[in-house]
């Protein structure tokens, strides 16, 4: 039985140039975990990260994403395209796979807000 | 440039155990994971498991667990592989090789070590 | 675990021909996957990273394409020291595993 509940920063914005945190945390079990993957909207692979392994950054990115902090993932150097959704799958022992969504839209204003909150989608 | 030498041929008895030797040089060894990989005669290559030397953190392919134990000795820039009651089903080439920098691909591999499982 | 098939065991091609080697994943692996040439008593060694990126010195005469469960490696003109097999290898998700591998054989 899966009990666990990811919680994610949701929907965010950051301007265009600079860079955002993707934070997606695993919470409610006790499930190990094994790997988390994150996700592009078109669903090609960002990064993984490997609990034992460490991160495996898809080569598209390695100049503009960083591990971290902790299972999360900096995407730097922000374009108009980045806009869209992102995805983090924690693969999890015993309890299978969890999901989570988060939305980062990006901004050419000066002024955009970067939002950061947590919440359950 | 990256080197990883491996221990040499070993002729052991079956019930036996044996460890072989993965010596770095060329690049820190806590900068990247190391794996071991067996394939046995004419046949694929099977992944046995990866470690991480920063931490000594250790993945294995379930097919491996109790018969390889993976260990790094930072000190000497070395990895090392024990294999447990061998059988002649362990009889096989190992291969040591690393993953690259932040990729899971494995970029440098040992010559390989043959070890025979014989009575 | 993931299955990685090679249909092919076995390839005959003739020197500047053009030969692709498939390989197939039980399920989705993205672009996680790599290609690797193991020439007779030699190791292994890394040709294609992340599906499609060629590695550091290796001819561009070698390529990789595909995503999801198919892949394939191409060689535009075969050359006499391209005889070996070629490996395909997933790493999405532990653990790590390799097709059955395809032994290129030059006529």
């Known amino acids: 039985m899966m009990t666990g509940t990811i919680e994610t920063t949701g929907n965010i914005s950051a301007k265009k140039g600079g860079s955002v945190i993707l934070q997606c945390h695993l919470s409610s079990t006790m499930a190990q975990v094994t790997q988390v993957n994150w996700e592009q909207h078109d669903h090609s692979l960002l990064a993984i990260r490997n609990a034992e392994l460490g991160w495996h950054i898809y080569p598209a990115f390695k100049d503009r994403v960083a591990p971290g902090p902790g299972l999360g993932l900096t995407l730097q150097s922000l374009t108009m395209n980045d806009t869209g959704e992102y995805f983090c799958t924690y693969h999890t022992y015993p309890d299978g796979t969890y999901r989570g969504r988060i939305f980062l839209e990006v901004l050419e204003s000066s002024v955009a807000e970067h939002s950061a909150r947590f919440q359950i989608p | 440039q990256v080197q990883l030498k491996q221990s040499g041929p070993e002729l052991v008895k079956p019930g036996a155990s044996v460890k072989i030797s993965c010596k770095t040089s060329g690049y820190t060894i806590t900068e990247n994971t190391m794996h071991w990989v067996k394939q046995s005669h004419g046949k694929s290559l099977e992944w046995i498991g990866g470690?991480?030397?920063?931490?000594?953190?250790?993945s294995y392919n379930q097919q491996f667990k109790g018969k390889a134990t993976l260990t790094v000795d930072k000190s000497s820039s070395t990895a090392y592989m024990e294999l447990r009651s061998l059988t002649s089903e362990d009889s096989a080439v190992y291969y040591c090789?690393?993953?690259?920098?932040?990729?899971?691909?494995?970029?440098?591999w040992g010559q390989g070590t043959t070890v025979t499982v014989s009575s | 675990d993931i299955q990685m098939t090679q249909s092919h065991k076995f390839m005959s091609t003739s020197v500047g021909d053009r030969v692709s080697i498939t390989c197939k994943a039980s399920?989705?692996?993205?672009?996680?996957l790599a290609w690797y040439q193991q020439k007779p008593g030699q190791s292994p060694k890394l040709l294609i990273y992340?599906?499609?990126y060629r590695y550091t010195g290796v001819p561009d005469r070698f390529t990789g394409s595909g995503s999801g469960t198919d892949f394939t490696f191409t060689i535009s003109s075969v050359q006499a020291e391209d005889l070996a097999v070629y490996y395909c290898?997933?790493?999405?998700?532990?653990?790590?595993?390799f097709g059955g591998g395809t032994k290129l054989e030059i006529k």
């Open positions: 399920q989705d692996v993205k672009t996680a």
């Open positions: 470690i991480n030397p920063n931490n000594g953190g250790t």
């Open positions: 290898h997933q790493h999405y998700t532990t653990p790590w595993t």
């Open positions: 090789t690393r993953s690259s920098y932040y990729r899971y691909d494995l970029d440098y």
């Open positions: 992340s599906a499609s």
